[in-house]
């Protein structure tokens, strides 16, 4: 759909005569008839297939035609068409003399024709006017013409319909070729799809208007890229919704059981070393000079047994003093007055030089001890059995009878309760002083993680159209994360797509 526009500019008829040569009385009151039709190699009479238009009397004999388009007048002349512009045309322009006021063809004498011109050719749609001038023996007509598209029609042939809109059916303006140009923030074939906030997660986020990012169930954050952990999850994270994966040092269904008391509470004082030994349980290894559960008590300096070779320690205001046994001297009784050459070892002990002869050490036979093998051994006096084991003297040797849960020569080894993998369903086992503890994965509880605490609501595949299913552990229900184009609690309804031409 478009308009053929013809702008008459000047008509010259100096002698004021008709085509027959007869003069007009008193002058040629001139009006024009225009016929637009399909292309003909030789323009012939016949129907004006593209349309006709007539003007009122525009002047007498010779005159210039005023441009009346701004004032709602009839110049340029409009010849609308409701078809694809073919690119070629034929045009006939007749100038007539009007003796009276009735300009209808049947009301005029046949010899009222002043002049007739006929042209044909090709014409592309465009804003530019083509200027032409036709001259006969008695007259001259200067005019210009063009073809433009009607409102909302575009393209080389005015065949593409495009009407800008900003509503539910689309958000666009039209390009010169008739293609849609989406308004900022919209995309898609008909510019119906909003462009979400930059970075908004493709699957976990969506939007109903531009620069928005609304999260699907189980997701949060400005870009919907953070999963929501299980309700009540204390010291844990998630990689998919409703999970509770415990941070290091935490256990339990809600990651609220402290397995790393040392790091979280730093209970050991005075530079002591802390070791975790179960839930909310720890052991402090004190530095010399300190004691107490948390190494909070300062020891007497002698409590660290600084005196060597059987020296006895005496506390003093400014420290301590070692009273050395006979044969030893030095701050810690670390030096000997004798060497192996003096045969210092008793009871058949063998002497070994140390520090290039500055010291010696006695290697005692069984049943003897002391720096110089001077003491007979009671093998149980040193309480060699650990963890409450009972020491039994057996002649030259001794034996430890261990309490349940301990083993080894000195009952020093803890029999691991975890060795037999007692925790079910992938639970983590922790050896404690008086037994064991299982840290259960999400969905299981009980002393050995044997109780399933939640039903997998996703097991029955309740979500349609390839939606992702998540189990909400707090309610034992499922949540469907719909792909683009589907809605509903099970993603069962397709979003209504627009018709091919929504206008």
């Amino acid at each position: 759909s478009g308009v053929f526009q013809l702008q008459l500019q000047e008509f010259i008829n100096e002698r004021g005569v008709l085509a027959s040569g007869r003069p007009c009385e008193p002058g040629c009151r001139t009006f024009f008839r225009v016929c637009l039709k399909h292309f003909q190699a030789v323009v012939s009479p016949g129907p004006c297939t593209f349309g006709t238009v007539s003007t009122p009397v525009l002047g007498t004999n010779s005159f210039a035609v005023r441009d009346d388009s701004s004032g709602g007048g009839r110049n340029p002349l409009q010849l609308p068409f409701n078809f694809t512009w073919p690119g070629t045309f034929s045009l006939i322009i007749e100038a007539w003399h009007a003796p009276g006021d009735d300009l209808r063809p049947e009301a005029l004498p046949p010899d009222a024709l002043i002049s007739k011109i006929a042209i044909q050719g090709s014409l592309a749609v465009g804003q530019n006017w083509l200027l032409d001038e036709q001259t006969s023996t008695l007259t001259r007509l200067r005019y210009s013409y063009r073809v433009i598209c009607s409102d909302n029609y575009y393209g080389d042939n005015c065949s593409r319909l495009c009407k800008k809109r900003n509503d539910h059916f689309g958000h666009y303006v039209c390009q010169p070729d008739g293609n849609l140009s989406c308004l900022p923030g919209w995309t898609g074939e008909y510019c119906q799809q909003p462009i979400c906030l930059s970075g908004c997660h493709e699957q976990n986020g969506y939007c109903s208007k531009p620069a928005e990012c609304l999260c699907r169930p189980g997701w949060q954050g400005r870009l919907c890229n953070e999963c929501i952990p299980h309700n009540g999850c204390r010291h844990g994270t998630c990689s998919t919704p409703w999970q509770c994966t415990c941070d290091e040092g935490w256990g339990g269904l809600f990651c609220d059981q402290d397995l790393n008391y040392c790091t979280h509470h730093s209970p050991c004082k005075n530079g002591a070393t802390c070791s975790n030994s179960g839930q909310r349980s720890y052991t402090c290894t004190c530095r010399p000079g300190y004691t107490g559960v948390d190494c909070e008590l300062e020891l007497s300096e002698c409590d660290s047994n600084p005196c060597r070779n059987g020296g006895s320690c005496k506390d003093q205001e400014d420290g301590y003093h070692c009273l050395c046994p006979p044969g030893y001297y030095g701050l810690h009784c670390e030096h000997s007055t004798l060497s192996c050459a003096d045969s210092p070892c008793f009871n058949g002990g063998s002497c070994r030089e140390r520090n290039q002869g500055a010291n010696y050490a006695c290697e005692c036979p069984p049943n003897f001890t002391g720096s110089n093998c001077e003491k007979k051994v009671d093998r149980c006096t040193s309480n060699p059995c650990a963890n409450g084991g009972q020491c039994l003297n057996r002649g030259p040797s001794r034996m430890c009878r261990c309490r349940p849960g301990f083993t080894g020569t000195y009952c020093e080894l803890h029999v691991s309760d975890c060795a037999r993998n007692p925790c079910a369903h992938g639970g983590t086992c922790h050896d404690l002083e008086n037994g064991l503890m299982c840290t259960c994965p999400a969905g299981f509880s009980g002393r050995r993680c044997e109780v399933r605490t939640s039903i997998d609501a996703c097991a029955s595949s309740p979500c349609f159209n390839r939606a992702t299913c998540y189990t909400d552990l707090s309610t034992d229900t499922f949540v469907c994360n719909c792909p683009y184009g589907f809605v509903g609690s099970r993603c069962e309804f397709p979003v209504g797509l627009p018709p091919s031409f929504p206008w």
């Epitope: 046994p325 006979p326 044969g327 007055t337 060497s339 050459a341 003096d342 210092p344």
Partner: nanobody, 119 residues
Amino acid sequence: EVQLVESGGGLVQAGGSLRLSCAASGDIPRIAAMGWYRQAPGKQRELVATVSNAATTRYADSAKGRFTISRDNAKTVSLQMDNLKPEDTGVYYCYSLATTVTPSWVNYWGQGTQVTVSS
């Protein structure tokens, strides 16, 4: 029981010399070593020098290079002290390291002799 008698102490100028002697008497068991300890005022008794039957000698760091210990025989010991300093002042005790009837080592001590070094 062993008795130890010291001699040779006295007052001396800094840089001077003294010679201490000690003799053991009485029911003498096996003596393995003899030597000298010093007790400065307000301080603990500390070893100065010792020599064993096998001629093993030990010196305190402060005595090295200035003092010389020697065993004249099994029952006597001497300490030659040269280039004396004020910090060498104190009571010098002779001692002997000996065995008893029950096999172990025992220290026997003398009464002590005063050494005073003036500056």
